[in-house]
């Protein structure tokens, strides 16, 4: 006889990324019986929501509903009517939101009320919207990487069904770069981790993994660049900054209130001759790349070693997955290639940086200025961060993987911020029954 | 871990009103949904109510629906439970209960990882 497919018995989760620059939407979906086995969740949907990110509302919080209509209306469409009331919907808000509570608790108070009258509309499980910690951010990520590189997983494989599979189960470190801070995630060998804030404690399937994380608030690219911009103003001699980190013949006014906005660059604020300067831009990356360095304090460590302004950092270990902004950025620049090492990659941007601002535009004529300009600025800082702020090498440059999507995942904390909320991340490996779950009969 | 310290209960005649307070300690308290829960002598613990973290979501039980109503105020790390028109079978000890980053819906389910108070007597006298 025939094998019949029974009706297909899964469940569904949402996620919000309310980052600092814009907000995304996750969608996942995951066999119901099968919710403790590892690798079984994948996201079936993004959504990028049309507009910045939700700290930028604080004026027009009436917006946010408007705001999140489409990528909402998105879900509805792709999960089935009959799911809908048992979907949970989280939303975790990062650095853009963690920098606005810096100045306002009431504010970002005020942000994440509405967020939460706006999804409380639709036909889901709404769980909660709130500002996730830095050390969340990167703890979920590395979950989320590993998760999907199978590295949880106790069955071992004499094939690779995952790209960047090494078939053991050492697991990868997470670099996760946003728009307002950055993480850096890693299991270190046998070394203690000196300062307690950094440390982790998890056991997942089975197998106690400590783990260093840290998140650098201020140091995503665009607060980075506001950072390097409120320190080089401080020294030109007038409204006209002669700025290496972009193209040549690029130019863009700045007004001084816009720089001094953000408290990332509170420590850079003077009063300044003019309301407004002008930005034009030189295009030379090793002048760029000495600018940048000037944001790392490497002068002070109260520790074995440092990562930069005083932080601990433990010598780092195995393969790292690039992530979010890495991968972005990178990508653009043609740069992800497993087999361009690190002086390739700063021979490519030493050369992209000097080229022309209107050749650049003509080359890439489909891509918006605001943010074409700034892929000179965002490479060399990727560069710098990686190599001066977390101490990689030339030869530990190749343990560096820039990844987008791992079997059709995102690379992100949203899943793994998922799978810890909804449990299916069990401390102890399940029992393996002698059967499996079987769609047909 | 967050903690839970009701007040409020007491004696009331039938007809009458209560109001209930519970003050969180520890914790974010916009990231907990709240709810009360109640149990009467001899039976198992039921659901009254429950909001969702800043107050736009709220579940009933029917028996409660249009009598009484839960509101937090986030400021003050506190929920409260108004009790108008209350009836003798709603003599029971009533129970704060807080659950993170879970829905009013889940929490009605006693589903996800609930915190407890210790308690506060309601009686109420026909």
């Known amino acids: 006889t025939q094998n019949k497919a029974l009706p297909e018995n899964v469940k569904y989760g949402i996620v919000l990324d309310a980052g600092s620059s814009h907000t995304s939407l996750y969608i996942y979906k995951w066999p119901a019986e099968k919710e403790n086995d590892t690798g079984v969740v994948h996201q079936v949907e993004e959504c990028r929501v049309k507009g910045p990110g939700i700290s930028k509302f604080v004026q027009k919080v009436n917006e946010i509903g408007i705001y999140l209509t489409d990528c909402m209306e998105r879900a509805r469409e792709v999960i089935p009517r009959s799911q809908h009331q048992e979907t949970p919907v989280y939303l975790g808000a990062t650095a853009g939101m963690r920098l606005l509570r810096m100045e306002s608790e009431e504010l970002a108070d005020r942000v994440l009320d509405v967020v939460e009258r706006s999804l409380s509309n639709y036909p889901f499980d709404f769980q909660g919207a709130r500002i996730i910690t830095g050390q969340e951010e990167g703890a979920y990520g590395w979950i989320t990487i590993n998760y999907l590189l199978g590295k949880f997983s106790q069955k071992t494989r004499w094939f690779s069904i995952v790209p960047y599979e090494t078939n053991n189960q050492e697991t990868f470190g997470a670099l996760d770069l946003g728009g307002a801070s950055t993480q850096v995630t890693f299991v270190p060998q046998n070394q203690t981790i000196e300062s307690p804030d950094n440390a982790l404690q998890f056991r997942l399937y089975g197998k106690d993994y400590n783990v260093y994380t840290h998140s650098f608030l201020c140091y995503g690219k665009d607060q980075a660049l506001w950072q390097k911009l409120a320190k080089d103003i401080q020294v030109a001699s007038n409204e006209i900054l002669r700025d290496p980190c972009f193209h040549p013949g690029y130019k863009k006014v700045v007004n001084v209130s816009d720089l001094y906005k953000t408290p990332c660059t509170k420590r850079f604020e003077m009063t300044l001759p003019f309301q407004q300067f002008e930005i034009q831009g030189i295009g030379n990356y090793q002048q760029c790349h000495q600018s940048i360095l000037e944001l790392f304090n490497t002068s002070y460590c109260p520790y074995s070693q440092c990562a930069f302004n005083g932080i601990f950092l433990p010598p780092l270990q195995g393969d790292f997955g690039a992530f979010s902004a890495f991968y972005f950025v990178m990508k653009f620049l043609n740069l992800t290639s497993e087999k361009v090492s690190q002086e390739k990659v700063t021979e490519m941007m030493k050369k992209f940086c000097a080229q022309p601002w209107e050749e650049i535009k003509t080359s890439y004529a489909g891509v918006k200025e605001k943010y074409l300009s700034e892929y000179c600025f965002s490479g060399t800082y990727i560069l710098s961060l990686l190599l001066q702020g977390y101490h990689f090498t030339a030869d530990s440059w190749e343990h560096i993987h820039f990844i987008g999507k791992i079997q059709g995942s995102d690379a992100g904390w949203t899943l793994g911020y998922m799978l810890n909320l909804t449990n299916m991340i069990p401390a102890e490996q399940p029992l393996s029954t002698p059967l499996s779950h079987s769609t047909y009969v | 871990q967050v903690q839970l310290q009701e007040s409020g209960g007491g004696l009331v005649q039938a007809g009458g009103s209560l109001r209930l307070a519970c003050t969180v300690s520890?914790?974010?308290?916009?990231?907990?949904?709240m709810g009360w829960f109640r149990q009467a002598p001899g039976q198992e613990r039921d659901f009254v109510t429950a909001?969702?973290?800043?107050?736009?979501?709220?579940h009933y039980a029917d028996s409660v629906k249009g009598r009484f109503t839960i509101s937090r105020d986030n400021a003050a790390n506190t929920v409260y439970l108004q009790m108008n028109t209350l009836k003798p079978e709603d003599t029971a000890v009533y129970y704060c209960?807080?659950?993170?980053?879970?829905?009013?819906?889940?929490?009605?389910?006693?589903?996800?990882?609930?915190?407890w108070g210790q308690g506060t007597q309601v009686t109420v006298s026909s």
């Open positions: 520890r914790g974010t308290f916009s990231e907990y949904s």
């Open positions: 909001i969702s973290g800043f107050g736009h979501i709220t």
């Open positions: 209960a807080a659950a993170w980053q879970t829905s009013p819906r889940r929490m009605m389910q006693m589903a996800g990882s609930i915190t």
